[in-house]
Amino acid sequence: SGTTNTVAAYNLTWKSTNFKTILEWEPKPVNQVYTVQISTKSGDWKSKCFYTTDTECDLTDEIVKDVKQTYLARVFSYPAGNVESTGSAGEPLYENSPEFTPYLETNLGQPTIQSFEQVGTKVNVTVEDERTLVRRNNTFLSLRDVFGKDLIYTLYYWKSSSSGKKTAKTNTNEFLIDVDKGENYCFSVQAVIPSRTVNRKSTDSPVECMGQEKGEFREI
């Protein structure tokens, strides 16, 4: 129960990519405002996004403190202009979010091919090590820093003249593949965390092809 005309939030949903984490909910407020609280399972509640008319709250700063923890959030509903008012039980109306473990659940962002270099019949393809908002010793960590060997990349590569996609995998950010001399190849990469059961794959990087400026060709 709650104050007249105040409705509880619903459809609380975590939206998270490379640890940038936003809690979303419904409904759009009519004569009410929201405040969000977040906590680890064993920790204290911390309030965020005070008395907002938004239906989202950026909780990145909280979850990056320990991405392996499991977090719970709750969204409180208050009557607009009367935020001290509480429900009939003396508590404001609120709804709990699903639990969220960033390390296991954040979506992997679209990777980017940083460069490729051909030397004879070998091509070295390098994937950009994307920066996250996770910090250690006041510096932002890369995706590789956070996930270590849990993160692999799958490279799809194909001759410009054909459609079949060969694959290679690496647990670094570099591939060294064999190619046919005189052929142009295209490349796309996908980040994967095989130890997960859901959200295992990123979307594919933009396709890069030999003969474009990103690559370098050296004849040996």
């Epitope: 459609s163 647990n171 996908q190 997960r196």
Partner: antibody, heavy 120, light 107 residues
Framework: EVQLVESGGGLVQPGGSLRLSCAAS????????IHWVRQAPGKGLEWVGY????????YYADSVKGRFTISADTSKNTAYLQMNSLRAEDTAVYYC?????????????WGQGTLVTVSS | DIQMTQSPSSLSASVGDRVTITCRAS??????VAWYQQKPGKAPKLLIY???FLYSGVPSRFSGSRSGTDFTLTISSLQPEDFATYYC?????????FGQGTKVEIK
Amino acid sequence: EVQLVESGGGLVQPGGSLRLSCAASGFTITDYWIHWVRQAPGKGLEWVGYIDPYNGYTYYADSVKGRFTISADTSKNTAYLQMNSLRAEDTAVYYCARDYGSLQVFIDYWGQGTLVTVSS
Amino acid sequence: DIQMTQSPSSLSASVGDRVTITCRASQDVNTAVAWYQQKPGKAPKLLIYSASFLYSGVPSRFSGSRSGTDFTLTISSLQPEDFATYYCQQHYTTPPTFGQGTKVEIK
């Protein structure tokens, strides 16, 4: 529990077509890769091709290239093998299999197989 | 394509015997080799991955090793349920390729 169930096998004449289905349960196919592997009677295992259902990327063995097509319906959590211009040498048990997708583990689960016989 | 040459093609052994099957890759495949067991009328089952790692639920009498491009599957003490056909497979490059198989029969 992870399960892969193939169906659609049967007797077909040379030059004919057949579509095999691979219904997956216990996991979401877009999170993995699906392979088709075949085994002619009394022979060894031969890799046919794969699909990444997440992006639709495929690759085929030379022996089936241009004749076979792998696809997936993610809403049904099912992969397919469309076989055209079938030849006697395509007679085999066809297995679909799940690729775990790591550097170390490759195929970790297989279906029970479905028999395709190409004969006049 | 990488060729996986498996030997022997068949062998006869008794319960309790130590059995060794080898596979040679035609070029470097790092440790990207798996071993599968297949019984008549059944699908293959994963035994060993990454050349030497025992897959979950597989008895510890099975082991795998690598020396350069040579890969070995060893059954330390053959059990009645181990009579089957064994295949190696490389997944280092596309297309992945299988060895021809080794049939382990009762002596």
